[in-house]
């Protein structure tokens, strides 16, 4: 018995489309072998019409496709513009047509509903507007105009020129009589529903001399576009509903059971909690089109999504919509990266950001997700030497460790740094990851003085105390600038006395600046790392002033100045929007990324006890 399964019978009508799903055991061999759809001949052969290797028969050219979904163990054959000639017996299968790994499918295409003579066919998408034109003769110019819908055997009045409107059409229909020159009236129906489809009759006059015109209204439900994205990757839904709804609230919803469509995000400010920190609704264009980016795709994000327009900001009957069926591929090319990183006030975090290793020369960015309105992500730093003014001295983007990962270090943490951050590049838009920074109770591990003042021409020594937990780490001092942090020579001064209950493995490592110049003014960081993986950092601002009295300065923890006030948010922020970054690809085809793995290591980053994987930026 063949393990392939599918629909035994498919019935449709001319002009329609069908999507035939065939199920197979998702073994490694099956997932990668050829998939086919063939038509059985009278003599028993089976002629391939379409296969997963790219073959498409001339009979199917331009109207069929075959899509494999390997992790689900399914493939789908879509056939459009059906005709009665398509009726017959088919097989969907794996491997070679004659080899029995197949399932028999009977497709029956019947003739569409017959139309009366002189019937005008209107084919309109769900939620859109149709205008049914009804000509009449001069003798009926002053007589009653009406539109009827054929329900079974009986015509039911929909609207007439005396002001009647059928309750099913209230608020969305009007009858327009053209100027005296034109012998035409028209009925405009908005927010079309599936139930509006059918045969209509428009009439001018009520007697035997009345003018009649038949109309057939076909309301098309949008076929969902199949979207196939990687776990931890991102998806962008581009929604173009037309200028007629440019000023109507927009939404993206996800169909749950039955008829419900739960709002994911809308332009009225609603956002589903499951998408907090990983969704942006891109501003609409003048034509009413917009896009929604969802990053950090999860298995449970799979499903049918609808975008639409309605004043309520949610799906209602008559909303114009677009539809997508999202599949999330669990065999992802995107590596796991931490989704939660924890740090303490005054401490630091080091965030590892994955990117497509084929695009090592791409520009790297880090931005802060903001939930206000429809969500936005103002840039904080990039790999080209730009740092937002508010973050000078405490934020650095490093190309290390390279080969598909870059590092972002943020220190001098405050409670205001808690939130969601996105790692992204101007290259492959799939590779966008989201990380949440949480500020937890605790003390920074590294101890440095507060602000330090150096004297021109003199020597300055700045201490950094490392607890014993970092005994196996490389310790360093560096001078921060907006392109990174340039390493400086430092001296190991032996065990530190700054820690209680810490043995000889604690360390005091000093930075010495000889013959201080004005150029030495700025931010200095001490930190720990293992190879190219960075751990905790601490920052000190060194100010330079004129000589007052001779000698060198040796700064201790006790003499530390208070930390400087936080700098004010600069008004010239850059954010991830079409207009904000020179490279249009950043939001032209947005996609993104993220998954589990909290950052490890005490105050710099502690792990939830339930976390199965930890990132130790400082403990690799």
């Amino acid at each position: 018995k063949s393990p392939i399964f599918g629909p035994e019978e498919v019935n449709s009508v001319e002009g329609n489309s069908v999507s035939i799903t065939c199920y197979y055991p998702p073994t490694s061999v099956n997932r990668h072998t050829r998939k086919y759809w063939c038509r059985q001949g009278a003599r028993g052969g089976c002629i391939t019409l379409i296969s997963s290797e790219g073959y498409v028969s001339s009979k199917y050219a331009g109207r069929a496709n075959l899509t494999n979904f390997p992790e689900n163990g399914t493939f789908v054959v879509n056939i459009a513009q059906l005709s009665q000639d398509d009726s017959g017996r088919y097989k969907c299968g794996l491997g070679i047509n004659s080899r029995g790994l197949s399932f028999d499918v009977s497709l029956e295409v019947s003739q569409g509903p017959g139309l009366l003579n002189d019937t005008k066919v209107y084919t309109v998408d769900l939620g859109r507007t149709v205008t049914i034109n009804c000509p009449f003769k001069t003798e009926n110019a002053q007589k009653r105009k009406s539109l009827y819908k054929q329900i079974g055997l009986y015509p039911v009045l929909v609207i007439d020129s005396s002001g009647y409107v059928n309750p099913n059409y209230t608020g969305r229909i009007r009858l327009d009589i053209q100027g005296t020159g034109q012998l035409l009236f028209s009925v405009v129906i908005n927010q079309l529903r599936l139930s509006d489809a059918g045969q209509y009759l428009c009439q001018a006059g009520d007697d035997s001399n009345s003018n009649k015109k038949n109309a057939d209204l076909q309301v098309l439900k949008p076929e969902p576009e199949l979207v196939y994205e990687d776990l931890r990757g991102s998806v962008t839904f581009h929604c173009a509903l037309g200028p007629e709804v440019a000023n109507v609230a927009k939404f993206l919803c996800r169909q749950s059971s039955g008829e419900n469509c739960d709002v994911v995000v809308n332009t009225l400010g609603k956002r589903a909690p499951a998408f907090e920190g990983r969704i942006l609704l891109n501003p609409q264009d003048k034509d009413g089109s917009f896009s929604v980016v969802i990053t950090g795709l999860r298995k449970e994000d799979a499903g049918r999504y609808l975008c639409g327009a309605h004043s309520d900001g949610q799906l209602q009957e008559g909303s114009p919509i677009q539809a997508w069926q999202l599949f999330v591929n669990e065999e992802s090319t995107i590596p796991r990266s931490p989704t939660v990183v924890k740090g303490v006030a005054g401490g630091s975090v080091a965030v590892l950001c994955p990117y497509n290793r084929k695009e090592s020369k791409s520009i790297k960015y880090w931005c802060l997700w903001e939930g206000a309105q429809n969500g936005r992500c103002p840039l904080l730093v990039d790999s080209e030497g730009w740092v937002k003014a508010q973050y000078e001295g405490r934020l650095s983007l490093l190309e290390e460790p390279g080969n598909g990962t870059f590092t972002v270090i943020l220190n001098q943490l405050t409670s205001r740094d808690a939130g969601f951050y996105w790692c992204l590049t101007n290259g492959d838009t799939l590779w966008r990851t989201t990380v949440e920074i949480k500020i937890i109770e605790g003390e920074p591990n590294l101890k440095v003085p507060g602000n330090v003042t150096a004297v021109l021409g003199e020597t300055l020594k700045v201490p950094c105390h490392f607890p014993c937990k970092f005994s196996s780490y490389e310790k360093y001092w560096c001078k921060w600038n907006n392109t990174g942090c340039q390493a400086l020579p430092s001296q190991d001064e032996g065990p530190s006395k700054a820690f209680v209950n810490c043995d000889e493995n604690s360390r005091l490592v000093s930075l010495t600046l000889n013959l201080v110049t004005r150029a030495d003014e700025g931010w200095y960081w001490c930190g720990v790392k293992q190879g190219h993986f960075y751990g905790e950092t601490a920052a000190v601002y060194v100010a330079v002033e004129e000589r007052k009295a001779a000698g060198s300065r040796d700064v201790s923890l006790a003499k530390a100045d208070a930390a400087p006030d936080e700098k004010v948010l600069d008004s010239g922020f850059r954010e991830i929007e079409n207009k904000a970054i020179q490279d249009p690809r950043l939001f032209a085809e947005e996609k993104a990324v993220a998954d589990t793995r909290d950052q490890a290591d005490g105050s710099r980053a502690s792990v939830d006890s339930g976390s199965s994987e930890e990132q130790g930026g400082s403990s690799r």
Epitope: F5, V10, V13, F69, N72, S257, E259, E317
Partner: nanobody
Framework: EVQLVESGGGLVQAGGSLRLSCEDS????????MGWFRQAPGKERDFVAA???????????YYSDSAKGRFTASRDNAKNTAYLQMNGLKPEDTAVYYC???????????????????WGQGIQVTVSS
Amino acid sequence: EVQLVESGGGLVQAGGSLRLSCEDSGRTFGDYIMGWFRQAPGKERDFVAAISWTGDSTYYKYYSDSAKGRFTASRDNAKNTAYLQMNGLKPEDTAVYYCAARTFRIDYDPRTASTYNYWGQGIQVTVSS
């Protein structure tokens, strides 16, 4: 909320026929699938047949090996009702029959009971020899 109500079960002689009906309410949007499952005493709930449909007069019918050629799934959209016509009934068809429904998704196998959101209360079919 979708509610499913089965009817048409009962006692029948081997070789006889029954038509089960399953009326559903509450569905207004999206492609849909209605499955028929059966559970004999002390056994698992097994797939029998399913019918899925779109709003454009297109139907897809699925059958288990044991139902193939004997049972026919159908649907009357006007009545919001699905049917399972069972011919050539055998004693081994004796079971409680359930109808189940959900939005159609191509990554959900119609044969997998756990993918269905809504279930009827079940109806007894007994085939005597």
